[in-house]
Interface confidence: medium
Amino acid sequence: MMTGTIETTGNISAEKGGSIILQCHLSSTTAQVTQVNWEQQDQLLAICNADLGWHISPSFKDRVAPGPGLGLTLQSLTVNDTGEYFCIYHTYPDGTYTGRIFLEVLESSVAEHGARFQIP
């Protein structure tokens, strides 16, 4: 029986050129997380595998950074980034849990918004 629940950052709006943190957390289950996939509609952004670590999709390598935790940071946002994002937790023995985040990217009102930063 699947008992887990996913908490996410929910619906977010951010400014063009800025950065966003997409964050999910799976709770209320003792299932082992084997892999987390981050997807935008039908496109794979990144994978975090428990054994192999992070893999960022080549088309997003320049502006996607892994973390914090199992989350994902998307930088240099464009209006085309607007849409649904999914964190897909593959677990054993429960199976798959999916969290949804809707991102709306708005035209910038202030040019210097959205500083880049390091995730150690």
Epitope: I12, G18, I20
Partner: nanobody, 111 residues
């Protein structure tokens, strides 16, 4: 209009403690993060908290810093213990979209 106001910084000796606060207004946030920028360095992520209470920490502060949030006050806190000289920086808070930054609060760890 969204506003973030950080406070609580100051001069502290190595091994000491400080508690930073970040008061947010303008809307309710599902996520708050603390970042820091040391002189001549890039801004780096320190810790973050989801509204439901789940927390994440950079390896460099794990076990020493604790992030928390009071949802009723729309305020995030960063309790910093066992401070080291390398924690010296201006500390900022931000929301999940990092569109808005406060003025920051300076933390100096020195004997």
């Amino acid at each position: 209009e969204v506003q973030l106001v950080e406070s609580g910084g100051g001069l502290v000796q190595p091994g000491g403690s400080l508690r930073l606060s970040c008061a947010a207004s303008g809307r309710t946030f599902s996520f708050m993060g603390w970042f820091r920028q040391a002189p001549g360095k890039e801004r780096e992520w320190v810790a973050s908290v989801l509204r439901g209470g789940y927390t994440w920490y950079a390896d460099s502060v794990k076990g020493r810093f604790t992030i928390s949030a009071d949802n009723s006050k729309n305020t995030a806190y960063l309790q910093m213990n066992s401070l080291k000289p390398e924690d010296t920086a201006v500390y900022y808070c931000a929301t999940e979209s990092m569109d808005y930054w406060g003025q920051g609060t300076l933390v100096t760890v020195s004997s």
